[in-house]
Interface confidence: medium
């Protein structure tokens, strides 16, 4: 239904706290360099204006669209051109082009320092002094670094953060209470960020139809007892919610997500028997819980998929009359039978089925042609299954750090032109798949591994798009989203690459490395490893292991030495010589 004032409508629906949080996220995701104080001031102005519209929907400007209101606010910021360069040109445009322009200027890799967590005591002090400002800073810092973070989920993580601080700041040993809990939230939030970015990429590059197909597969796996009409309704609603968030319409997105959660809880009987626990929770927790609810028990006695999609004499007629609905029911029926497959795999199978029907239904004897389609799925299913087995075996043998290093070598050989920081970030993220997925029960491994890898590789593609340097990467990134992971897996050593010259300074280290946290030490060592591979792309695993073991031994020795600086300056050059010899 149309509302006289959109801003008053959203303020009423969401309540002041969520309204302010979402407006802050929106501004922080659009203008990523502004300080918290600048954004907080704008948020307060917008909120005050929303309140005047709630009091009188006919008041001046209350009938304007949210894009117009928010865009006008952003464009009124002083020194916009100095700080944001050509983004300021967006302000010369009218809506909806202005908002599109802002979206195009979102930076997936802003040059901001890493978000450092303060000391426990300092954190607790500022949290106790002003919890609202403290949480505002959290929303601002996360949102500006992750301009496509799913806004209602970010409110959920802020709520988690708040609860952890409330609990731990009352403890004697604040540090040991906070660290593991906040690390847990950070890890989950980072995964949430890359997953949502993948959804927005799907929407931006391939449109709503592609996202809806993803949603049908995912929902059918989770709710195998819901019928096709129900799954279609949920997929349509979920597509709308994600389209709004990806498009920067955060108030509408959060409002519609709350509506969807309400609908699901009111219609549990026709959706799933597993929703009750989620539905008992307050809004943010409820929506989060529903998004990762366990799969419902699959109905017994499901007939073989072949009955309707291969053996039925009317397959081509059914396909021709309503292609999307027919393919939708295929995806639904296949997905509900296979919670053990990744969504990417299910979409590849649906694509193969579609291509088979396109080809066969034009032939003289269609049934003879498409009759083997299910058998032709076999290699498509085996490939990711083998990938999971091989990689989980390797992870179990090497542990997370060793597994990351193996992936780093592999990917540096595939795309040595890519910058070392990007390769290290990608390998560290890809390597976490072991810890995240390889410990799960067998039937959950494949969906966990492949859908996580796809999301990480999407980030690799986004970063590479900014500065394309590798033909290998361009080739894999320009295909369809579901083919990316198999494409990257199939890449081999890039034969066109001219090895980097050996530079001693790349492998020269100083005593300051000794005081770095373990994670930073690992990154330094992994940076050296990538550089070694760039110098010798065809080095054997054995050669690289020898060098890295020597390097680790050198660090260990010098960091334990009484005079660390002397040890580094005398032993360092010897290490470099030994490395060159080992790789000669």
């Amino acid at each position: 239904e149309a509302h006289k004032s959109e801003i008053a409508h959203r303020y009423n629906d969401l309540g002041e706290q969520h309204f302010k949080g979402l407006v802050l996220i929106a501004f922080s995701q659009y203008l990523q360099k502004c300080s918290y104080d600048e954004h907080a001031k704008l948020v307060q102005e917008v909120t005050d204006f929303a309140k005047t519209c709630v009091a009188d929907e006919s008041a001046a400007n209350c009938d304007k669209s949210l894009h117009t209101l928010f865009g006008d606010k952003l464009c009124a910021i002083p020194n916009l051109r100095e700080n944001y360069g050509e983004l300021a040109d967006c302000c010369t445009k009218q809506e909806p082009e202005r908002n599109e322009c802002f979206l195009q200027h979102k930076d997936d890799n802003p040059s901001l320092p890493p978000f450092e967590r303060p000391e426990a005591e300092a954190m607790c002090t500022s949290f106790k002094e002003n919890p609202t400002t403290f949480m505002g800073h959290y929303l601002h810092e996360v949102a500006r670094r992750h301009p496509y973070f799913y806004a209602p989920e970010l409110l959920y993580y802020a709520e988690q953060y708040n609860e952890i601080l409330t609990q731990c700041c009352a403890e004697a040993d604040k540090e040991s209470c906070l660290t593991p809990k906040l690390d847990g939230v950070k890890e989950k939030a980072l995964v949430s960020s890359v997953r949502q970015r993948m959804k927005c990429s799907s929407m931006q590059k391939f449109g709503e139809r592609a996202f809806k197909a993803w949603a049908v597969a995912r929902l059918s796996q989770t709710f195998p007892n819901a019928d096709f009409a129900e799954i279609t309704k949920l997929a349509t609603d979920l597509t709308k919610v994600n389209k709004e968030c990806c498009h920067g319409d955060l108030l509408e997105c959060a409002d519609d997500r709350a509506e969807l959660a309400k609908y699901m809880c009111e219609n549990q009987a026709t959706i799933s028997s597993k929703l009750q626990t989620c539905c008992d929770k307050p809004l943010l927790k409820k929506a989060h819980c529903l998004s990762e609810v366990e799969h419902d028990t699959m109905p017994a006695d499901l007939p073989a998929i072949a009955a309707d999609f291969v053996e039925d004499q009317e397959v081509c007629k059914n396909y021709a009359e309503a292609k999307d609905v027919f393919l939708g029911t295929f995806l639904y029926e296949y997905s509900r039978r296979h919670p053990d497959y990744s969504v990417s795999l299910l979409l590849r199978l649906a694509k193969k089925y579609e291509a088979t029907l396109e080809k066969c239904c034009a032939e003289a004897n269609p049934p003879a042609c498409y009759g083997t389609v299910l058998a032709e799925f076999q290699p498509l299913v085996e490939e990711p299954k083998n990938l999971v087995k091989t990689n989980c075996d390797l992870y179990e043998k090497l542990g997370e750090y060793g597994f990351q290093n193996a992936i780093l070598v592999r990917y540096t050989q595939k795309a040595p032109q890519v910058s070392t920081p990007t390769l290290v970030e990608a390998a560290r993220n890809l390597g976490r798949v072991g810890t995240k997925c390889c410990t799960l029960p067998e039937d959950q491994r494949l969906p966990c591994v492949e859908d996580y890898l796809s999301a990480i590789l999407n980030r690799v593609c986004l970063l590479h798009e900014k500065t394309p340097v590798s033909e290998h990467v361009t080739k894999c990134c320009s295909g369809s989203l579901v083919e990316r992971r198999p494409c990257f897996s199939a890449l081999t050593v890039d034969e066109t690459y001219v090895p980097k010259e050996f530079k001693a300074e790349t492998f020269t280290f100083h005593s300051d490395i000794c005081t770095l946290p373990e994670k930073e030490k690992q990154i330094k060592k992994q940076t050296a490893l990538a550089e070694l591979v760039k110098h010798k792309p065809k080095a054997t695993a054995e050669q690289l292991k020898t060098v890295m073991d020597d390097f680790a031994q050198f660090l260990d020795t010098c960091c334990k030495a009484a005079d660390k600086d002397t040890c580094f300056s005398t032993e360092g050059p010897n290490l470099v010589t030994r490395c060159k010899d080992a790789l000669a």
Epitope: A226, T270, P303, Y332
Partner: nanobody
């Protein structure tokens, strides 16, 4: 949007008959196999019968074979279930679904009660 509306349920004595209807809209009805499913309170849904898109291939659960008959009218976008020789154990909520499968339906379903 895809919509299915069930009707025709009611209270009937053992041995009596009922005819259920399911009106479909929002999709190419004649292109799809359809099913009737029933659900007892607190139990998982149970497949009853299904029919292909053209209407010449019908299948039935053993418990209803010989008593129930599924049919469709593609011109009217409607699916039917003729239920004869009803027994108390046929008391359940009945609903139609797209495809030949068991699933919970978003429709309210239509209640069939067989009791003397």
């Amino acid at each position: 949007a895809v919509q299915l509306v069930d009707s025709g349920g009611g209270l009937v004595q053992p041995g009596g008959s009922l005819r259920l209807s399911c009106a479909a809209s929002g999709f190419s009805f004649g292109s799809f196999g359809m099913s009737w499913v029933r659900q007892y309170p607190g139990k998982e849904p149970e497949w009853v019968s299904s029919i292909n898109g053209r209407g010449d291939d019908t299948r039935y659960a053993d418990s209803v074979k010989g008593r129930f008959s599924i049919s469709r009218d593609n011109a009217k976008n409607t699916l039917y279930l003729q239920m004869n020789s009803l027994k108390p154990e046929d008391t359940a909520e009945y609903y139609c679904t797209i495809g030949r499968s068991v699933s919970r339906s978003r429709t309210q379903g239509t209640q069939v009660t067989v009791s003397s």
